[in-house]
Amino acid sequence: PEMAQPVDPAHNVSRLHRLPRDCQELFQVGERQSGLFEIQPQGSPPFLVNCKMTSDGGWTVIQRRHDGSVDFNRPWEAYKAGFGDPHGEFWLGLEKVHSITGDRNSRLAVQLRDWDGNAELLQFSVHLGGEDTAYSLQLTAPVAGQLGATTVPPSGLSVPFSTWDQDHDLRRDKNCAKSLSGGWWFGTCSHSNLNGQYFRSIPQQRQKLKKGIFWKTWRGRYYPLQATTMLIQPMAAEAAS
């Protein structure tokens, strides 16, 4: 389940006498190229991340799906550590994401694409807890994008991360990760799951359909999406020019 090492080396950052803490710090010291970088958040060993540099500073790509090349139906330890290929599909790893965000509120950007060429970009203000909270995700402000605040559980509600072998969802009667697929902040199973099974066509059986990648309030519950990207950026004072 370890993330593959990239073929090309990480960019050099000469203005820091240590590894950058995150993509935002890279941006702050003048890096304007997006791509693979080695970072070292406070108290964490170094690791590679995909950075996207924008007018709002540096973002860290934490998830990418687009072709079904990587199996996302994995246990807790895999979701904690990360898996996949940084050049392709991957999950960065909950512990790595938490080491980047620390105790800060963050902005989470979610890019969705369906099979008809439609796309949606959403932004959330979130707080990610540590492993002691099962990496609970809490919305701290309303949702951005055309979809309004109905895209996820209500603001203020904290939703733990769940996998088939560590059931932390908000349903007492079932294990969302088992009845759906992959690991996710499942809540009551029905809102979204961007780590579900990759389907190239819509399965006929509902039981299989439920296991796909979906975002209920965009294309509808259980519509299997073609591609997703998730990015995160800790909130601080805006990045220095």
Epitope: G35, S55, D56, L121, G145, E238, A239, A240
Partner: antibody, heavy 118, light 107 residues
């Protein structure tokens, strides 16, 4: 529906000033970076300036640094480009563009012509 | 700065033709490449972003491909409304740079 409406262009003498405006609607303006891009017939499209979603950070191409100021008023859903000490080489069509960052410029205003000539 | 080159600069084609326009970056741009269409007197309109994602409302005859430094826009069957100028934009390096454009005209 996302809409960006540019205004404020015109004919101005070298060394004088002009202020462009871009009124945005159909999306949560305060969540998006914004930019100005200009088009010079002989040089094609070139980025001029960008501003972060909150307005705290601004970025400029070297040739306009110290002369142009990009700003925004999130309460009015409007971004601006204050152009001072204008030069003949600033003559162009100026477009306001929305910049989600992750996907590059997506929506553009209709553009305004700025002509710097004596 | 990343330099973008486009080929060809001019292209003459007929309705129904399949055409390809190429964009080359001076370094790897990690698939952060957009394509825009611009008609005379109008603002650029985004067709494709991040190499191959079709902008909502754009016909499926437009498609994009590529990786590293080389990218292609393909129009599978030219329609009368497709005669215009096409630009690429790299946004791997903030704030991005545009290609010089390809003018597609009726043969």
């Amino acid at each position: 529906e996302v809409q960006l409406v540019d205004s404020g262009g015109g004919l101005v003498q070298p060394g004088r000033s002009l202020k462009l405006s871009c009124a945005a609607s159909g999306f949560t303006f305060s969540n998006y970076g914004m930019a100005w891009v200009r088009q010079i017939p002989t040089k094609g499209l070139e980025w001029v300036a960008s501003i972060s979603s909150g307005g705290g950070n601004t970025y400029y191409r070297d040739s306009v640094k110290g002369r142009f100021t990009i700003s925004r008023d999130n309460a009015k859903n409007t971004q601006y480009l204050q152009m001072d000490s204008l030069r003949s080489e600033d003559t162009a069509t100026y477009y306001c563009a929305r910049d989600p960052g992750i996907t590059g410029f997506d929506y553009w205003g209709q553009g305004v012509m700025v002509t710097v000539s004596s | 700065d990343i330099q973008m080159t486009q080929s060809p600069s001019f292209l003459s084609a007929s309705v129904g033709d399949r055409v390809t326009i190429n964009c080359k970056a001076s370094q790897n741009i990690n698939k952060y490449l957009n394509w825009y269409q611009q008609k005379l007197g109008e603002a650029p309109k985004r067709l494709i972003y991040n190499t191959n994602t079709l902008q909502t409302g754009i016909p499926s005859r437009f498609s994009g491909s590529g990786s590293g430094t080389d990218y292609t826009l393909t129009i599978s069957s030219l329609q009368p409304e497709d005669f215009a100028t096409y630009f690429c934009l790299q946004h791997n390096s903030f704030p991005g740079t545009f290609g010089p454009g390809t003018t597609l005209e009726l043969k």
